[in-house]
C-alpha cells in the first residue's frame, strides 16, 4: 500500500482542517487508513482522524482543531495498520480556505433594486470576520451567455444591482464565497445558489 | 477537594533507588498532564519531569535524563518518580503538581494549580 | 533553555504600602494574543508553593485581588497593591511555554 499524492491540508481558521490524498489503488479509506495528529505543544496528546473515500483512491479527513493561532504547527502520521506511510507537518495558519458564506436572501421588494444579502461565516470574534472580501457570481439558466462576477470588497455582506442591469422576465441565480485578503487565503467553496424571477419593468416613459 | 498527596521519599545512599508517589483525587486525573518539582535545601524551586495526561508525551530536565523515569496510573490516579542512580545533588524535597488540561486539542493551561505537601528525598552514604 | 531572570531578589516591605517584583524571560513566552506562558507562585516558610498569577495577568481561583500579573513577551511584573503581612515568601515567576520548564531566582518578600 502506497501514497500516490501526500496529504494536502487546509484549514477553515475555526475547527477544522481537511486533508485530501490519493492512494495508489483502490483503498477503503476508513477500514485501512488512519490519520495521526498532534499539536507541536507542551503535553499535547495525538489525535485520531478517520478517513473518509473521495473517489475510488482519493481519501478526506477532517481533522477536528482547536481555534488557530499562527503558532499552531502539527504533526502529521498517516498510518496503514502498523505501517507509516507518510510523515508530514502542516501550519493551519498559512493554509486556510474560508468557510462558505451562508444564508444567501434575494430581496426584490426593493424599488429599481435587487438587494443581496448573505451571512459572514465567522463569528465576531474570528480574526478572519472582518477579513472577509467576497465574490458574487450571477447567472441565469434562461440565458446561458449571462455570467457576471461582482466583487465585494467592503465588509458588509451585501451587493445592490440596478434591476434594469437584468433582463426582465427570467431567472436568475446567485451564488456567493469569500476569501481573507490579510490571510493570504484561497477562495472558500461557492455558497449554496438561491435563485429569483426578474419581474422588474422599466417604467413606461423609459421604454 | 481537589488534592495530591506525595509518598515514598527517604535517605537512600548514592547509587541507590528511590520511588515516589503522587496521588490525585477530586479531579479527573487522566485528563491532566502532571509535574514533579523538586527543591534543594535553601535553594529554588527546579522543575524535573512532566508527563500528559495519557503518560504518551514525556519531559524531562537534562540533569535527571535517562536517571528518573516519570510514569502514571491512571486508573489508580497515581503518578511516579522512579530514580536511580541517585546522587547527593538529588537531595531536595520533591512536589508533584497539577499541570494542564492535556485532553483538547491544544492543552487548556491553568498554571501548576495544585500541589502536594511535598516528600523529602536525602541522598548521603 | 528559557532563562529566566527576577529582581529585586530581596524587597523590605512597608505593610500597606505596594511592591513590584520584575521578572525577565530570553525568549519571548507569547504564544497567540493573550497567552503568555508565565505564571507567579508564592512560597511561604515550611509550606509547598501556591499559584498566584498564570498565563502572565490570569488570577487564580482565591487569591486576593491586591496581586496582579502584567507584561508581555519578555517583560513581566508581579504588582501587590497593599502588601499585608501574611504575603512575607519566597516569589518565584515561572515559564511554561515548553520543556524545560524554568524558575526565576525568586525573590524574598519582607516586613520592614
Known amino acids: 500500500m502506497k501514497v500516490l499524492q501526500e496529504p494536502a491540508c487546509v484549514s477553515d481558521y475555526m475547527s477544522i482542517s481537511t486533508c485530501e490524498w490519493k492512494m495508489g489503488g483502490p483503498t477503503n479509506c476508513s477500514a485501512e487508513l488512519r490519520l495521526l495528529y498532534q499539536l507541536v505543544f507542551q503535553s499535547s496528546e495525538t489525535h485520531t482522524c478517520v478517513p473518509e473515500n473521495n473517489g475510488g483512491v482519493g481519501c478526506v479527513c477532517h481533522l477536528l482543531m482547536d481555534d488557530v493561532v499562527s503558532m499552531d504547527n502539527y504533526t502529521l502520521d498517516l498510518w496503514a495498520g502498523q505501517q507509516l506511510l507518510w510523515k508530514g507537518s502542516f501550519k493551519p495558519s498559512e493554509h486556510v480556505k474560508p468557510r462558505a458564506p451562508g444564508n444567501l436572501t434575494v430581496h426584490t421588494n426593493v424599488s429599481d433594486t435587487v438587494l443581496l444579502t448573505w451571512s459572514n461565516p465567522y463569528p465576531p470574534d474570528n480574526y478572519l470576520y472582518n477579513d472577509l472580501t467576497y465574490a458574487v457570481n450571477i447567472w441565469s439558466e434562461n440565458d446561458p451567455a449571462y455570467s457576471r462576477i461582482h466583487n465585494v470588497t467592503y465588509l458588509k455582506p451585501t451587493l445592490r444591482i440596478p434591476a434594469s442591469t437584468l433582463k426582465s422576465g427570467i431567472s436568475y441565480r446567485a451564488r456567493v464565497r469569500a476569501w481573507a485578503q490579510h490571510y493570504n487565503t484561497t477562495w472558500s467553496e461557492w455558497s449554496p445558489s438561491t435563485k429569483w424571477y426578474n419581474s422588474y419593468r422599466e417604467p413606461f416613459e423609459q421604454r | 477537594e481537589v488534592q495530591l498527596v506525595e509518598s515514598g521519599g527517604g535517605l537512600e545512599q548514592p547509587g541507590g533507588s528511590l520511588r515516589l508517589s503522587c496521588a490525585g483525587s477530586?479531579?479527573?486525573?487522566?485528563?491532566?498532564?502532571m509535574t514533579w518539582v523538586r527543591q534543594a535545601p535553601g535553594k529554588g524551586l527546579e522543575w524535573v519531569s512532566s508527563?500528559?495526561?495519557?503518560?504518551?508525551?514525556?519531559y524531562y530536565a537534562d540533569s535527571v535524563k535517562g536517571r528518573f523515569t516519570i510514569s502514571r496510573d491512571n486508573s489508580k490516579n497515581t503518578l511516579y518518580l522512579q530514580m536511580n542512580s541517585l546522587r547527593a545533588e538529588d537531595t531536595a524535597v520533591y512536589y508533584c503538581?497539577?499541570?494542564?488540561?492535556?485532553?483538547?486539542?491544544?492543552?487548556?493551561?491553568?498554571?501548576?494549580?495544585?500541589w502536594g505537601q511535598g516528600t523529602t528525598v536525602t541522598v548521603s552514604s | 533553555d528559557i532563562v529566566m531572570t527576577q529582581s529585586p531578589l530581596s524587597l523590605p516591605v512597608t505593610p500597606g504600602e505596594p511592591a513590584s517584583i520584575s521578572c525577565t524571560a530570553s525568549?519571548?513566552?507569547?504564544?497567540?494574543?493573550?497567552?503568555?506562558?508565565v505564571d507567579w507562585y508564592l512560597q511561604k516558610s515550611g509550606q509547598s508553593p501556591q499559584l498566584l498569577i498564570y498565563?502572565?495577568?490570569k488570577r487564580a481561583s482565591g487569591v486576593p485581588d491586591r496581586f496582579s500579573g502584567s507584561g508581555s513577551g519578555t517583560d513581566f511584573t508581579l504588582k501587590i497593591s497593599r502588601v499585608e503581612a501574611e504575603d512575607v515568601g519566597f516569589y518565584y515567576c515561572?515559564?511554561?511555554?515548553?520543556?524545560?520548564?524554568?524558575f526565576g531566582q525568586g525573590t524574598k518578600l519582607e516586613i520592614k
Open positions: 515561572m515559564q511554561a511555554l515548553g520543556s524545560p520548564y524554568t
Open positions: 508527563i500528559s495526561g495519557s503518560g504518551g508525551n514525556i
Open positions: 503538581a497539577k499541570d494542564r488540561v492535556s485532553i483538547t486539542i491544544r492543552p487548556r493551561y491553568y498554571g501548576l494549580d495544585v
Open positions: 498565563l502572565g495577568s
Open positions: 477530586g479531579f479527573t486525573f487522566r485528563d491532566f498532564a
Open positions: 525568549q519571548s513566552l507569547l504564544y497567540s494574543i493573550g497567552y503568555n506562558y
